[in-house]
């Protein structure tokens, strides 16, 4: 699987999850999030050669098409597969609120 | 929606579904598919600016991050959202077989 366990331990050029730390205030301008200050959102990148963690039949077909037609602009793209939530603390006026934001952390990638 | 109805009728630079005809024999080397000769598989391409058909909270966050940090390599990617099957005819020996291949035709795209 193209997950953090594999990708963070290997120098992988092809589609893999990459570490990306996002600071809410500095990187997004989100002053309203009080905790955490930031988090590892991670991201997916790298080429998707034929059959690499193909998401659907279409991505398999497109991967093969791209292999046999290397000049073509059509090719699968490396995108998130498994995502995890992040719990944040913010204030509505003087009232603290805790919310679980879904799909905030990329744990693995796929070629789609 | 970034679907064929919209994308095929507009000159859209950003993420959209694009027409792509694939000939099974010529483009894939699949001689075993007898019918159809080929089909419109289509594909997704184009930049994913902030909030454009964002698939998850992560893609929204990543889009904003990319907007505020344009030098960053991390950005959402335009990939298939809705796919449709394709029915094909092939032979096993002298016996004709009809099979519906799932997720073969891209009908719409999203930023993931």
């Amino acid at each position: 699987a193209l997950d953090t366990n594999y990708c963070f331990r290997n120098l992988e050029e092809n589609c893999c999850v990459r570490p990306l730390y996002i600071d809410f205030r500095q990187d997004l301008g989100w002053k309203w999030v009080h905790e955490p200050k930031g988090y590892y959102a991670n991201f997916c990148s790298g080429p998707c050669p034929y059959l690499r963690s193909a998401d659907t039949t279409h991505s398999t077909v497109l991967g093969l098409y791209n292999t046999l037609n290397p000049e073509a602009s059509a090719s699968p793209c490396c995108v998130p597969q498994d995502l995890e939530p992040l719990t944040i603390l913010y204030y509505v006026g003087r009232t603290p609120k805790v919310e679980q934001l879904s799909n905030m952390v990329v744990k693995s990638c796929k070629c789609s | 929606a970034l679907d064929t109805n919209y994308c095929f009728r507009n000159l859209e630079e950003n993420c959209c579904v694009r027409p792509l005809y694939i000939d099974f024999r010529q483009d894939l080397g699949w001689k075993w598919v007898h019918e159809p000769k080929g089909y419109y598989a289509n594909f997704c391409s184009g930049p994913c600016p902030y909030l454009r058909s964002a698939d998850t909270t992560h893609s929204t966050v990543l889009g904003l991050y990319n907007t505020l940090n344009p030098e960053a390599s991390a950005s959402p990617c335009c990939v298939p959202q809705d796919l449709e099957p394709l029915t094909i005819l092939y032979y096993v020996g002298r016996t004709p077989k009809v099979e519906q291949l799932s997720n073969m035709v891209v009908k719409s795209c999203k930023c993931s």
């Epitope: 002053k31 009080h34 905790e35 719990t87 603390l89 913010y90 204030y91 509505v92 006026g93 003087r94 009232t95 603290p96 805790v98 | -």
Partner: antibody, heavy 119, light 111 residues
Framework: EVQLLESGGGLVQPGGSLRLSCAAS????????MSWVRQAPGKGLELVAD??????????YYSDSVKDRFTISRDDSKSTVYLQMNSLRAEDTAVYYC??????????WGQGTLVTVSS | DIQLTQSPSSLSASVGDRVTITCRAS??????????MHWYQQKPGKQPKLLIY???NLASGIPSRFSGSGSGTDFTLTISSLQPEDFATYYC?????????FGGGTKVEIK
């Protein structure tokens, strides 16, 4: 650098009025709630009045000890928060601090202004 | 309103001593994994200064000899090795609900 400069304190007779001002600089004033915290001589800290940002409709809070006598307000265009104090009593004698609380804690404090209520 | 009780109300210690101050809330001031308790230092004639926010986070410019811990109703401020400039009064404050309240203070004096 965040700065909070209080003014308007002084000696006033019981039943009198005073208006405290706090001029803020060095941060996005419009985004944050502002508070007045007082400290009577030799005593602890008491939050007396609080006003949140426009985002939350300038909602105010007052401690029971000053309710109906004190009014907190803010002028975002001047980055200033005010405390109008009426019907002052001897027990209102204290140093009044202007503070900013971006998220639960009072991160920055002014130097304080002394209010003395005495005849 | 949530009441905060600090103990001791005063203590005498020497330079180099490890000092622990506790703050007990009348009800929990934690929400999920977030602990909404904060600590301040005040020296005579000066305004209070934020030391620790959300139970364990060191405020900007505060020396690492200060630390905070706790959750729910019981919280602790620790000075690992007391310095001459640390003799002051320390206050806890919660932000679990409105109104936010302060503890009565703990005065740290020179023995």
């Amino acid at each position: 650098e965040v700065q909070l400069l209080e003014s308007g304190g002084g000696l006033v007779q019981p039943g009198g009025s005073l208006r405290l001002s706090c001029a803020a600089s060095g941060f996005d004033f419009n985004s944050y709630g502002m508070s007045w915290v007082r400290q009577a001589p030799g005593k602890g800290l008491e939050l007396v009045a609080d006003i949140v940002s426009k985002t939350y409709n300038y909602t105010t809070y007052y401690s029971d000890s000053v309710k109906d006598r004190f009014t907190i307000s803010r002028d975002d265009s001047k980055s200033t928060v005010y405390l109008q104090m009426n019907s002052l009593r001897a027990e209102d004698t204290a140093v009044y601090y202007c503070t900013v609380a971006p998220g639960g804690s009072f991160d920055y404090w002014g130097q304080g202004t002394l209010v003395t209520v005495s005849s | 309103d949530i009441q905060l009780t600090q103990s001791p109300s005063s203590l005498s210690a020497s330079v180099g001593d490890r000092v622990t101050i506790t703050c007990r809330a009348s009800q929990s001031v934690s929400i999920s994994r977030f602990n909404l308790m904060h600590w301040y230092q005040q020296k005579p004639g000066k305004q209070p200064k934020l030391l620790i926010y959300r139970a364990s986070n060191l405020a900007s410019g505060i020396p690492s000899r200060f630390s905070g811990s706790g959750s729910g109703t019981d919280f602790t401020l620790t000075i690992s090795s007391l310095q001459p400039e640390d003799f002051a009064t320390y206050y806890c404050q919660h932000s679990r609900e409105s109104p936010w309240t302060f503890g009565g203070g703990t005065k740290v004096e020179i023995k």
